[in-house]
Interface confidence: low
Amino acid sequence: MMTGTIETTGNISAEKGGSIILQCHLSSTTAQVTQVNWEQQDQLLAICNADLGWHISPSFKDRVAPGPGLGLTLQSLTVNDTGEYFCIYHTYPDGTYTGRIFLEVLESSVAEHGARFQIP
C-alpha cells in the first residue's frame, strides 16, 4: 500500500532571466527512493539515480543545475519555461509517486510588483 505523499513548492512565479528552485519532498513512507526524474510536460530534464548520481539532459545542460538535494535549479529563465513540472519518485517497495509544480515566468516589471499566478 502506498502511504507516502509528495509535498511540492506548488504554484510559483519567477522573473525572466532569473533562477528558481524546484523542490519536492516525499514523506509519510519508509520506502527507499531509487531514482527521481524531473520532467517538463513530456520532456526529461534530469535524473537523480541513487547509484549513479545526476544526469542532466543535453538540451538543458546550460540552464539546469542539480540540487539542492533532490531538487532542481532552473537558471536564465525565459517566458517559454512557463508550464508544468513534475518530480517522479521511483521507490521500493511502494512504486512511483508524482508531484506537480506550476511555474510562471514573468517579465521583470510584473514580477517586481508581486503578481502571482493562481490555479483555481
Epitope: Q35, N49, D51, G53, H90, Y92
Partner: antibody, heavy 125, light 112 residues
Framework: QVQLVQSGAEVKKPGSSVKVSCKAS????????ISWVRQAPGQGLEWMGS????????NYAQKFQGRVTITADESTSTAYMELSSLRSEDTAVYYC??????????????????WGQGTLVTVSS | DIVMTQSPLSLPVTPGEPASISCRSS???????????LDWYLQKPGQSPQLLIY???NRASGVPDRFSGSGSGTDFTLKISRVEAEDVGVYYC?????????FGGGTKVEIK
C-alpha cells in the same frame, strides 16, 4: 524489439589494438547500459566493462583497466569497445549486451538483454 | 570481488524430468531497494547467451514458465520443472550487485 549488431571478426597482431562496434536499434539507447563481456575459447563469461550513454562515464573490470576503453556515440546509437596492447590470451568472442532499456527506478547494469551476435577477435603473430 | 560458485559443473538430464542448478555468492546480492541483483543466462551451443531470469526470480520475456528462479542473499537456485531437448547448453548465474560484475563458472546441461 531491441537488437544489437556487432562488427565482424578481426585478426590482430600482438601489441596492436582492436575496436569492436555494437549498433543498437529500437528502445532508448541513451538510458540503457551497454556492457561488454568476453568468452575465451571453451571458457566462461567475463565482464569487461559497461557504459550508460546518459551518464557518460564507463566502469571497467580492474583486470582490463588502462587497456580497455568503452565509448558510445548517441548520434548513431553505437557503442564501442577498444582493447589495446593485445596478447594471445585476448583471443576470444567479444559480446555487447544491453541493460534495462527504460529510465525507471532500476537503472544500470542490472541484467543483460539482448546480447549481440558476438565478434571473434584472434590475436596471432 | 564477489565470487560466484555454481554447482554442479555438469548435469545430465532426462527429458521430462526436473533439474536444479545452485549458485552461491561470496557476498549478499540483496540491494537496499529490496531486489536481489542475480540473473540467470543460458548459452545454447554456438549461440550468444540469453537472459532467462533477472533480479533473482523474474522470468524474462518469452522464457517458458518451466524455468523459475528463487533464493535471496547468497543462495540462489534455477529450476527447470520438466527438461526439454532444447534446454541443453551452459547455464550461468551473474551478480550485478557490485562492480566488477561476475559470472559463475557455468553448468553444462546435457541430455542423458
Amino acid at each position: 524489439q531491441v537488437q544489437l549488431v556487432q562488427s565482424g571478426a578481426e585478426v590482430k597482431k600482438p601489441g596492436s589494438s582492436v575496436k569492436v562496434s555494437c549498433k543498437a536499434s529500437g528502445g532508448t539507447f541513451l538510458s540503457s547500459a551497454i556492457s561488454w563481456v568476453r568468452q575465451a575459447p571453451g571458457q566462461g563469461l567475463e565482464w569487461m566493462g559497461s557504459i550508460i550513454p546518459l551518464f557518460g562515464k564507463a566502469n571497467y573490470a580492474q583486470k582490463f583497466q588502462g587497456r580497455v576503453t568503452i565509448t558510445a556515440d548517441e548520434s548513431t546509437s553505437t557503442a564501442y569497445m577498444e582493447l589495446s596492447s593485445l596478447r594471445s590470451e585476448d583471443t576470444a568472442v567479444y559480446y555487447c549486451a544491453r541493460g534495462p532499456s527504460e529510465v525507471k527506478g532500476i537503472l544500470g547494469y542490472v541484467w543483460f538483454d539482448p546480447w549481440g551476435q558476438g565478434t571473434l577477435v584472434t590475436v596471432s603473430s | 570481488d564477489i565470487v560466484m560458485t555454481q554447482s554442479p559443473l555438469s548435469l545430465p538430464v532426462t527429458p521430462g524430468e526436473p533439474a536444479s542448478i545452485s549458485c552461491r555468492s561470496s557476498q549478499s546480492l540483496l540491494h537496499s531497494n529490496g531486489y536481489n541483483y542475480l540473473d540467470w543466462y543460458l548459452q545454447k551451443p554456438g549461440q550468444s547467451p540469453q537472459l532467462l531470469i533477472y533480479l533473482g526470480s523474474n522470468r524474462a520475456s518469452g522464457v517458458p514458465d518451466r524455468f523459475s528462479g528463487s533464493g535471496s542473499g547468497t543462495d540462489f537456485t534455477l529450476k527447470i520443472s520438466r527438461v526439454e531437448a532444447e534446454d541443453v547448453g551452459v547455464y550461468y548465474c551473474m551478480q550485478a550487485r557490485r562492480i566488477p560484475i561476475t559470472f559463475g563458472g557455468g553448468t553444462k546441461v546435457e541430455i542423458k
